[in-house]
């Protein structure tokens, strides 16, 4: 994990003739903000969803009013960095899009209007942990100067943020074969040797010797799909590539897309498909016209001469979406049902199912308890698409197959001693207490706060807890 950081140094007219008109005027004061979109890999042809590595919006810059007759200077910029956190490894090669947006602050009905001033894009190689890289990009008559870097979040280190660092166990040096973690010389690189046999695809470890499973996988070596029902295709052995994944709540829960945008999950986050006339990571930007160049990937913009009339993007072959922002790829046919996430593995597609669904296409609604046996007299409790067993006394685990130690939770109060029994537990109460769990004090006059003990049992005798 780590953060990609972008520092905008200046945005203003580029060198050469044809200086651009100032984007702001006395009648229409405005301020700038920036959006960065990151995709892994160098190839613009990659069938990655937009901003698969992440995206960020800057704060709004200071309000700027053009001085009459003066050429457009470098425009005042927002404070601070644009930060795009990444959860997985830093890919080393990435594509970026940086957009400069203008927010007009005149007397617009319905609040400020946004329009796209410039968009620059590029492809770069960058190692995490390295120094700031400087760049200059031109978009028409505008010039954008910026720096960027990728840095790892502790305990991750390395050029891809995949190595972990741990505090030294000994003050003098790191263990055998382990290097100090530059620049944290007081820490050592952790040897990430997972448990032998831990699935390299579905398991990982943060401590040596462990095997933690990715969402949807289970078992000591993370080789068992959480649901294997109907996971095999009619085509025989190759079908083993389709694990059925059943993760928990997704990034689209609660629909982060504004203005009627529809949300779809991407491998790392979410993506909004905006209705016409809206734009931005969460469809939060409106008032876009053809003059703003809203059509990506060579799309042709038609109509939309003013913010009140919607534009239409006619997309070139291979692209779709209201802004031609989506590549038509093999997931575009939506093979995954019930909100499942489609992943193109190259040799096959895989569906990552939402909670409560399973099957290669997430087509099976998991009737929580159907076909689920709870062992040893346990009863199945339905809930949220994931069955749960309520186990009989003395048993535990997901399917009540594990013998539980009924005394492990120290159920006997007031110093009572617990004894495991074939039908549960027995509490031997300390003098002065009674009850199945020794929870009731015995009154000094011999009467208790409860009805009298059953015949044959004196207060203080062990009582069976059923």
């Amino acid at each position: 994990a780590g953060v990609f950081e972008l520092q905008i140094h200046s945005f203003g007219p580029g060198p050469g003739p044809g200086a651009p008109r100032s984007p702001c005027s006395a009648r229409l004061p405005c301020r700038l903000f920036f959006r960065v979109c990151l995709k892994p890999g160098l190839s613009e042809e990659a069938a990655e969803s937009p901003c698969a590595l992440g995206a960020a919006l800057s704060a709004r810059g200071p309000v700027y009013t053009e001085q009459p007759g003066a050429p457009a200077p470098d425009l005042p910029l927002p404070d601070g960095l644009l930060q795009v956190p990444f959860r997985d490894a830093w890919p080393g090669t990435f594509s970026f899009i940086i957009e400069t947006w203008r927010e007009e602050l005149g007397d617009q009905i319905g609040g400020p209007a946004w329009s796209l001033l410039a968009r620059v894009a590029g492809r770069r190689r960058l190692a995490a942990g390295g120094p700031w890289a400087r760049d200059i990009q031109r978009a028409g008559a505008w010039e954008l100067r910026f720096s960027y870097r990728a840095r790892c979040e502790p305990p991750a280190v390395g050029t891809a943020c995949t190595r972990l660092c741990r505090p030294r166990s000994a003050p003098s040096r790191c263990g055998p074969g382990l290097r100090p973690c530059a620049p944290l010389e007081d820490e050592c690189e952790a040897p990430l040797v997972c448990r032998a046999g831990c699935s390299p695809e579905h398991g990982f470890c943060e401590q040596p010797g462990e095997c933690r499973c990715l969402e949807g996988w289970t078992g000591p070596l993370c080789t068992v799909p959480v649901s294997t029902s109907s996971c095999l295709s009619p085509r025989g052995p190759s079908s083993a590539t389709t694990g059925c994944l059943v993760p928990g709540p997704g990034p689209c829960d609660g629909n982060p897309c504004a203005n009627g945008g529809s949300c779809s999950e991407t491998p790392r986050s979410f993506e909004c498909t905006c209705p016409r006339g809206f734009y931005g990571l969460r469809c939060e930007v409106s008032g876009v016209t053809c003059a703003d160049g809203p059509c990506f990937n060579g799309g042709l913009c038609v109509g939309g001469a003013d913010p009140d009339s919607a534009y239409i993007c006619h997309c070139p072959p291979g692209f779709q979406g209201s802004n031609c922002e989506k590549r038509v790829d093999r997931c575009s046919l939506q093979p995954c049902r019930n909100g499942g996430l489609c992943l193109d593995l190259g040799h096959a597609l895989r569906c990552r199912c939402r909670a409560g669904f399973a099957g290669p296409r997430c087509e099976h609604d998991l009737d929580d308890c159907a076909g689920r046996a709870c062992a040893n007299g346990g009863t199945c409790v339905e809930g949220g698409g994931a069955h749960r067993c309520s186990c009989a006394l003395g048993f535990g685990g997901r399917d009540c197959r594990e013998r539980a130690d009924p005394c492990a939770a120290r159920p006997c109060a007031h110093g009572g001693r617990c004894y495991a029994h074939f039908s549960g537990l027995v509490c031997a109460c300390a003098p002065g207490y009674m009850g199945a769990r020794c929870e009731f004090p015995v009154h000094p006059d011999g009467a208790s706060a409860l009805p009298a003990a059953p015949p044959g049992l004196r207060p203080g005798d062990p009582q069976r807890y059923l």
């Epitope: 295709s233 190759s238 291979g318 046919l333 939506q334 093979p335 096959a348």
Partner: antibody
Framework: EVQLVQSGSELKKPGASVKVSCKAS????????MNWVRQAPGQGLEWMGI????????IYNHKFKGRFVLSVDKSSNTAYLQISSLKAEDTAVYYC?????????????WGQGTTVTVSS | DIQMTQSPSSLSASVGDRVTITCHAS??????MGWLQQKPGKAPKGLIY???NLEDGVPSRFSGSGSGADYTLTISSLQPEDFADYYC?????????FGGGTKVEIK
């Protein structure tokens, strides 16, 4: 046994419309995409488009956008290709072919083909 | 669009011959391709999927190989029923595209 049975030959005048059907049996209709492929007389194969019968989502070859519409009727396990404003150059054999929606993506079973002749 | 260049466009061979047909994609397609056989007046029939896997019921004399952008269909010992047209098809990217076809004729 998997079968794709297409409707019979059609003779149409220019400007008319035609709807070719492809009835599927022997498998779960919604688990496989349906492709449509055109073969003009003496020519090779040309991919027209694809439909996901479960959702109705379609993707067309840009050459076949506009006058060509793919659709399905899930209740009868039937896929359709409709061509409007027919032209002489639409004269061809039209095939439907199923394709696994997740794994190997092969077009493994094909309909027998429907010949559409456009002539005045 | 991905172009699929198939060669040769036709070939003459005798029963028992080993026949090789090649297909070159204009960009890498990661094995997402297949081979089809079409006999006159009939619908195409799937032979090979995913570059090298035999469709059900296809005789083992047919085999596919290749990776990246270059793929080959081999018939190890040509039989009388194998005289037909053969097409490659890529399904790595929309629109799917077919090779121009290879006509295998009796010498």
């Amino acid at each position: 046994e998997v079968q794709l049975v297409q409707s019979g030959s059609e003779l149409k005048k220019p400007g008319a419309s035609v709807k070719v059907s492809c009835k599927a049996s022997g498998y779960t209709f919604t688990d496989y995409y349906m492709n449509w492929v055109r073969q003009a007389p003496g020519q090779g194969l040309e991919w027209m488009g694809i439909i996901n019968p479960y959702s109705g989502v379609t993707i067309y070859n840009h050459k076949f956008k506009g006058r060509f519409v793919l659709s399905v009727d899930k209740s009868s396990n039937t896929a359709y290709l409709q061509i409007s404003s027919l032209k002489a150059e639409d004269t061809a054999v039209y095939y439907c072919a199923r394709q696994d929606s997740l794994l190997d993506y092969a077009m493994d079973y094909w309909g027998q083909g429907t010949t559409v002749t456009v002539s005045s | 669009d991905i172009q699929m260049t198939q060669s040769p466009s036709s070939l003459s061979a005798s029963v028992g011959d080993r026949v090789t047909i090649t297909c070159h994609a204009s960009q890498g397609i990661s094995g997402n391709m297949g081979w089809l056989q079409q006999k006159p007046g009939k619908a195409p029939k799937g032979l090979i999927y995913h570059g090298a896997n035999l469709e059900d019921g296809v005789p083992s004399r047919f085999s596919g190989s290749g990776s990246g952008a270059d793929y080959t269909l081999t018939i190890s010992s040509l039989q009388p029923e194998d005289f037909a047209d053969y097409y490659c098809v890529q399904y790595a990217q929309f629109p799917y595209t077919f090779g121009g076809g290879t006509k295998v004729e009796i010498k």
